[in-house]
Interface confidence: low
């Protein structure tokens, strides 16, 4: 509700109004809690007095505000209670149905999951949702069909299509496909993107790097993100949780923020880390009404009431002008249990028994000042960056504590807020932005950008220098040509054009004309000013020495033709001929070639064999085969020279080794013995005791070592044993007890041993018996 | 995913001249630096230089005299020569992509500098 | 002797947290991104940090960088055996107009 003239003496606004100009005219604008010109009158919708979804009206009635009830479709009565005959009256919605009244004979029914109809009286075969995967419900004769999206098939929808079964195939440039429920992805070769690999992947474009990162090619299908403070990922797609380790206390939940976090503080407690009790009745200047007195308590607040209201907030009144006091000439109005001081110009307080404090506006501006309707001082309610009684004190945010200014920035004070000045290479209004400095592309000429703190790095390609690399290093500054020679600048080179007579890559070298080898054939080049000459090669001529001497005029070749070399000739000689001059005949016969004996006769580059009788050929290099009738019996056949020769087998003999040799012919058996001839050999049958193939030698019994402490002696069919001292028996087995003939004298006392015996002797005697 | 592989000879003689070759595979040889890095036991991990795709190249100061480099992207080849080599050039020779940080690595192939 | 210094050897048991160093110069740390890489026996090296704190895809989240001046660290949490390997730090340095190493350090897992 508004009123005139609110700024005029004596028309202010009451309980929290504010006086605000509308239309050229002036007017208060209540709070909730009050109406009226002057938002004097308590709001009696406040209390909901109209029922049945009535809405409740604010009226004027003589002054004094009222209200009046405007109901809902189907009620009336003051305050809706009086049902009206209509079409909901009789229920007509079943199975728990809610009827809403179009008009008093029309309704429609607003029908509990499972039911449908005009009265709910259908079952819904689409109560249940049986269509999964965002499918469409439509209920067909008693039961449902399911229309599904794209990506779904079957009777309820829960088949997944299969896209990547489709042909050709959804993901291009070599892409490969991944079925997913309800959709499909896509995984793209390095060298394309998009949702079907359709697009080439140009690194940074578009940029992948999130929340503000820069982007920086490192490849053909490669890149890199700088991040800004507080993110983290290849992509800073990952905000740093900065809540690791913080510092909410009183049951704060620490909430993450971009590069820090902030607490989110139960009701009781306020400040940056829930430290400091919340002050109810300063953060709330109404939180007890009607001029209650607010005590701040730990976790709340208490109000004490003003006579004549009560309750929590003090929004109860109790009081009435029948027992009212209105101080100084204040009107007293007449309320439902209750009254009001209506306070002339300058008053204020329930009573009116106080000054208005806020008249002689006390607050600085910008500020809202509200009388203490207790003791009518000034409360002033300060802006943002302002603070003491009268808001007119400034304050420090830079003293607070932490510095607001992020990355070292120097925070400065300003009436009502602050401003941070930022170190190079950061910027915002807190500093919380890093300056990639490198963004510009600053370096030129293919240099790399190294983004640094408030600063840039290029890297030059080589033959560029500057900040920017935007110099072509002048590699012509140190006058490198010599000789006046003209110096031209390149990338990371220089070039000399030289004067004449001058050359090399600093025109350092006087022009030699023997330089471009003039003189041939190896001639020696004598250099001379601006000239040369040339000592020619031995058989060369000429200016250039390029005239090669005729060393075949006159032919010196005397059988064979000429061909002219360098200071030299060479003769191809006519067959049968050699020497440097072809003046020799060559005497083939000189190499022997005819064979077996044949005689050579020399010819002209020829010669002739004479060969002997059975061999044959130019070089009498075949001997005929005497061999080839086999005239050798039981032997190989060697062919000589006119004739052969019969080499026999063992056993046979005779030009022809047809005659067996008979072994026996000799006696070769001694000792009686009888021999038996064979071929290429005999066998002896010897005697009894003989043995051998002559039987010359009778059987050595002693070959078996018989004697085992003795030595051995052969004899015919036998052997004789003579053994070693102490021992005895036919093999010399028998150790002999030397000391049983008692030879230990003298009462020495005797020990057998394995060859012979020992005595120990007694005092006074020695020797080997103790003789 | 790009490869690298390294070749070249195993065994050079003192002030003889150091030729290696490394292949790419896998990927594109432009808009790419092309490094070259040693690691000795005495003096540990040493950057020898780059050569960019375009052919530019830049190399250690104090090797500066005694490198050159090359591509040739139609081979997709890197190659790298050192001069007048001494015992101290005895080491595990790598190529990889990249100026400033590497990635990915040759597996590095072994020189050894002796008569 | 190496332009970056760092630590011949660190060790810590499984599912432990070490930290490597890497002190260096305002040529070379101080005003130019810092790398890290891995290198397991018989291995090349392998780029594991790099601009200072951001990964390669691929590289477990385990391991993370940091800068500050003129010294950069290398952090790894929750060890594992088969994070034995020598680590080295690598920058440009302005001064000497090349990339410059560190000399490496061992980390062992006991």
């Known amino acids: 509700a508004r009123g005139p003239r609110c700024s005029q003496p004596g028309e202010t606004c009451l309980n929290g109004g504010k006086c605000e100009a509308a239309n050229g005219t002036e007017a208060c604008v209540c709070g909730g809690a009050f109406v009226g010109p002057r938002c004097q009158d308590p709001n009696p919708c406040l209390s909901t007095p109209c029922k049945n979804a009535g809405t409740c009206h604010v009226v004027d009635r003589r002054g004094v505000a009222d209200y009046a009830c405007s109901c809902a479709l189907g009620f009336s009565g003051p305050l809706c209670l009086t049902p009206l005959d209509n079409a909901c009256l009789t229920n007509p919605c079943r199975n728990g149905g809610t009827c809403d009244l179009l008009t008093l004979t029309e309704y429609k029914c607003r029908c509990p999951p499972g039911w449908s109809g005009k009265s709910c009286q259908q079952a819904d075969p689409c109560a249940s949702n049986p269509c999964a995967n965002g499918g469409q419900c439509l209920p067909f004769e008693a039961s449902y069909i399911c229309h599904c999206p794209p990506s779904f098939h079957g009777p309820t929808c829960r088949q997944d299509v299969n896209e990547c079964g489709q042909k050709p195939g959804l993901c291009r440039h070599g892409g490969t496909c991944h079925n997913e429920v309800g959709s499909y992805r896509c995984v793209c070769r390095a060298t394309h993107t998009g949702p079907n690999c359709e697009r080439p992947y140009v690194p940074c474009s578009p940029s992948p790097c999130q929340n503000g990162g820069t982007c920086r090619p490192t490849g053909d299908v490669t890149h890199e993100c700088a991040c800004l403070p507080g993110f983290t990922g290849q992509n800073c797609e990952e905000n740093i949780d900065d809540c690791p380790g913080n510092n909410c206390k009183n049951g704060g939940a620490c909430v993450d923020g971009v590069n820090t976090y902030n607490c989110r503080c139960p009701p009781e407690w306020t400040g940056q880390y829930c430290t400091e009790d919340v002050d109810e009745c300063q953060l709330m200047p109404n939180a007890c009404q009607n001029g209650g007195t607010c005590h701040n308590t730990h976790g709340g607040y208490n109000c004490v009431c003003v006579n004549g209201w009560t309750g929590e907030d003090c929004s109860e009144n109790i009081d009435d002008c029948a027992s009212a006091a209105c101080f100084h000439g204040a009107t007293c109005h007449d309320r439902v249990a209750s009254f009001y001081c209506e306070c002339p110009h300058g008053r204020t307080g329930l009573l009116c028994h106080l000054n208005d404090a806020c008249i002689s506006n006390p607050c600085n501006e910008g500020s809202n000042c509200d009388t203490n309707p207790v003791n009518g001082k000034a409360i002033c309610t300060c802006p943002s960056g302002y603070t003491g009684p009268a808001c007119s004190q400034d304050v420090d945010e830079c003293s607070l504590g932490a510095n607001p200014c992020e990355h070292a920035g120097k925070c400065i004070n300003t009436l009502g807020s602050f401003e941070c000045q930022c170190l190079q290479g950061y910027t915002g209004p807190r500093c919380e932005i890093d300056v990639n400095e490198c963004v510009s592309n600053p370096c030129q000429n293919d240099a790399t950008c190294l983004d640094q703190i408030g600063e840039f790095q290029c890297i030059c390609m080589p033959g560029y220098e500057g900040v920017h690399c935007e110099v072509n290093t002048d590699e012509c500054a140190s006058s490198p040509c010599l000789h006046n020679g003209r110096c031209l600048d390149k990338i990371n080179e220089f070039q000399c054009e030289c004067p004449t007579g001058f050359t090399g890559h600093l025109c350092q070298y006087d022009v030699d004309e023997c330089a471009s080898t003039p003189c041939k054939n190896g001639a020696k080049c004598l250099d001379g000013p601006n000239t040369y000459t040339c000592v020619c090669t031995e058989g060369y001529t000429g200016t250039h020495c390029e005239v090669d001497i005729d060393e075949c005029d006159p032919d010196p070749c005397h059988y064979g033709s000429c061909k002219d070399g360098v200071a030299t000739f060479t003769c191809l000689c006519r067959p049968g001929y050699t020497g440097h001059h072809c003046e020799t005949n060559i005497n083939e016969c000189s190499s022997q070639p005819c064979r077996h004996g044949g005689t050579c006769q020399d010819r002209d580059n020829a010669y002739l064999c004479f060969c002997l009788k059975g061999t044959t050929g130019p070089n009498c290099e075949i001997n005929l085969d005497d061999c080839a009738s086999s005239p050798c019996d039981s032997g190989t056949c060697l062919d000589k020279i006119d004739g052969y020769e019969c080499a026999c087998e063992p056993g046979y003999t005779g030009s022809m080794c047809n005659i067996n040799i008979d072994e026996c012919a000799g006696n070769p058996c001694h000792n009686g013995g009888t021999c038996e001839d064979g071929i290429n050999g005999f066998t002896c049958r010897c005697p009894e005791g003989y043995h051998d193939p002559t039987c010359l030698s009778e059987v050595n019994e002693c070959n078996s070592n018989p004697c085992v402490h003795g030595a051995c002696r052969d004899s015919l069919n036998g052997y004789k044993c003579d053994c070693d001292p102490g021992w005895s028996g036919t093999n010399c087995d028998i150790n002999n007890n030397e000391c049983e003939s008692n030879p230990c004298v003298n009462g020495g006392t005797c020990k057998d041993m394995t060859s012979g015996y020992v005595c120990t002797c007694r005092e006074g005697f020695s020797g080997p018996n103790c003789q | 995913e790009v490869q690298l592989v390294e070749s070249g000879p195993g065994l050079v003689k003192p002030s003889e001249t150091l030729s290696l070759t490394c292949t790419v595979s896998?990927?594109?040889?432009?808009?790419?630096?092309w490094s070259w890095i040693r690691q000795t036991p005495g003096k540990g991990l040493e950057w020898i230089g780059y050569?960019?795709?375009?052919?530019?190249?830049n190399s250690n100061p104090s090797l500066k005299s005694r490198v050159t480099m090359s591509v040739d992207t139609s081979k997709n080849q890197v190659s790298l020569t050192l001069s007048s080599v001494t015992a101290a050039d005895t080491a595990i020779y790598y190529c990889?992509?990249?100026?400033?940080?590497?990635?990915?690595w040759g597996r590095g192939t072994m020189v050894t500098v002796s008569s | 002797q190496s332009v970056l210094t760092q630590p011949p050897s660190v060790s810590g048991a499984p599912r432990q947290r070490v930290t490597i160093s890497c002190s260096g110069s305002?040529?070379?740390?101080?005003?130019?991104?810092v790398n890290w890489y891995q290198q397991l026996p018989g291995e090349a090296p392998k780029l594991l940090i790099y601009?200072?704190?951001l990964l390669p895809s691929g590289v477990s989240d385990r391991f993370s960088g940091s800068k500050s001046g003129t010294s950069a660290s290398l952090a790894i949490s929750g060890l594992q055996s088969g994070d034995e390997a020598d680590y080295y730090c690598?920058?440009?340095?302005?001064?000497?107009?090349?990339?410059?190493f560190g000399g490496g350090t061992k980390l062992t897992v006991l």
């Open positions: 601009y200072d704190n």
């Open positions: 305002s040529s070379n740390i101080e005003n130019n991104i």
């Open positions: 050569v960019l795709y375009t052919g530019s190249t």
């Open positions: 690598a920058a440009w340095d302005d001064s000497l107009k090349a990339v410059v």
């Open positions: 990889a992509r990249g100026n400033g940080w590497y990635l990915p």
């Open positions: 896998g990927g594109s040889m432009t808009s790419n630096f």
